[in-house]
Amino acid sequence: FDWQYINPVAHMKSSAWVNKIQVLMAAASFGQTKIPRGNGPYSVGCTDLMFDHTNKGTFLRLYYPSQDNDRLDTLWIPNKEYFWGLSKFLGTHWLMGNILRLLFGSMTTPANWNSPLRPGEKYPLVVFSHGLGAFRTLYSAIGIDLASHGFIVAAVEHRDRSASATYYFKDQSAAEIGDKSWLYLRTLKQEEETHIRNEQVRQRAKECSQALSLILDIDHGKPVKNALDLKFDMEQLKDSIDREKIAVIGHSFGGATVIQTLSEDQRFRCGIALDAWMFPLGDEVYSRIPQPLFFINSEYFQYPANIIKMKKCYSPDKERKMITIRGSVHQNFADFTFATGKIIGHMLKLKGDIDSNVAIDLSNKASLAFLQKHLGLHKDFDQWDCLIEGDDENLIPGTNINTTNQHIMLQNSSGIEKYN
């Protein structure tokens, strides 16, 4: 069935998914399974930050330009519980989590773990918001590429129970001994979808703002004790942020979070919504986004009701851009698109018709051009300005979705779709 109007990843939960996993295991011929290195001139480091230790604190993965390039690569999915959470999200038995762990548990992403920050420069900051069923580590291809071009990227792990899994510490003593409290994805009844998704997107926006405040506090020299005992000195971040150059980026539910965050927090100068799922947003936000906003969509995820809501963000006095990546699917923005070979990736809808590296490259370059323009960066990202306009053989300017049919419009905006 397909009820993506109220669930952007419903297609992953069909009973066929179990068969697909079995095929995945049987084939196990992954082919190209590497998360790509950043294309920019900077080496990239990675660390995690949790402050404070409670579920009301901030938890994020930080990608940043690093001083050296000789550290161990970063473990992509760092705890077994994340695999259990993914199996719950996919609607499979928790044992499937162990199989996923077997397949992906030792996979790394090309960032130097706990490498020192490259000093001597103030970096623009991007706060990144993950999609439903994801968590802070699953968009490393985007985070690493941005960091390789001179950004500090804070990939938030949301505690609104939209992540497959996340953890916190009940108290200080639990934090000291590393006794994690795990929080798993919340499955909603249909009658809860509207109000809970809206509450979640509001909390997510607050978590993005809180992450920004924390990093700006550290930048100002406020001593912050990371609840995670890691060999990265947060004091390195003092005076490292270009405090006027801050953006928010997110995928799917994270795309809605971008819009909610922009409407609430003017410190974010612009936003990029990657294949945004608009359903969680309340009607009041559309007219309250003064900052420039860029929609980068996949070809096969979007549908009329969603595009109509994106268009509601438009007004003559506001900077709005939209492009669609030809042959792309919803999962082209997340790392799982790189975790399997072509055939299996296609079967699982992790890959589209377009090569995954080409798709993420287009998205990243268009994003960099947009960020340069609206954060006032003195870089060479304007070489990709044409991508913002959709001027490329693999791009569609605007959208491929027809929203002029009133019948479709009304049918899809009701919020209740029948199972197909």
Epitope: K56, D160, L183, R186, K189, E199, Q200, Q203, K206
Partner: antibody, heavy 121, light 107 residues
Framework: EVKLEESGPELKKPGETVKISCKAS????????VHWVKQAPGKGLKWMGW????????TFADDFKGRFAFSLETSTSTAYLQINNLKNEDTATYFC??????????????WGQGISVTVSS | DIVLTQTHKFMSTSVGDRVNITCKAS??????VAWYQQKPGQSPKLLIK???TRHTGVPDRFTGSGSGTDYIFTISSVQAEDLALYYC?????????FGGGTKLEIK
Amino acid sequence: EVKLEESGPELKKPGETVKISCKASGYTFTDYSVHWVKQAPGKGLKWMGWINTDTGEPTFADDFKGRFAFSLETSTSTAYLQINNLKNEDTATYFCARGDNYLYYYTMDYWGQGISVTVSS
Amino acid sequence: DIVLTQTHKFMSTSVGDRVNITCKASQDVNTAVAWYQQKPGQSPKLLIKWASTRHTGVPDRFTGSGSGTDYIFTISSVQAEDLALYYCQQHYSTPWTFGGGTKLEIK
């Protein structure tokens, strides 16, 4: 339909203990928190605190630390408020209300009918 | 703790009138303001959350607005059944706090 049903009125003497209940129905009990609110006769509303129905962890407002306890019976979807060493100023109507365990800006959307507790010697 | 002040303890109105009830917070509560209606002998009923979002089933004559520290609850055309106590509440940070209440009366 979401419902919170509270137990009947209580008449107690100073120094005694009262335990009042709030039975929830119409939703998944362990997804939503239970809050307690006090309303003294002719007065406004005062938030006492809440209990996380997933973990059982209670949180109290400063004025309600010490003599007050929140507890759960998850099997029957029931939350309890216990007040020890009752004082005259505990005379009030006590409301339970639904919040959310992890959405920490989620306000109290459904309320019980209220339980009148009278403390008099 | 965040203090909420409802300046008017009582407000007189007539059926069909438009009425505004104000609520001022001692600090920015980021639109996390709810409005409740309480009739005599009943429990409070949520009308508005997040300053302007109507709760399920609430008639559209009830609206809310505001941001920062200043919030307004409006009944566009008062009905006889709207005579009640109205409380604002902040759901931004614990301890959650309520305003003192505004009693709506018929002239």
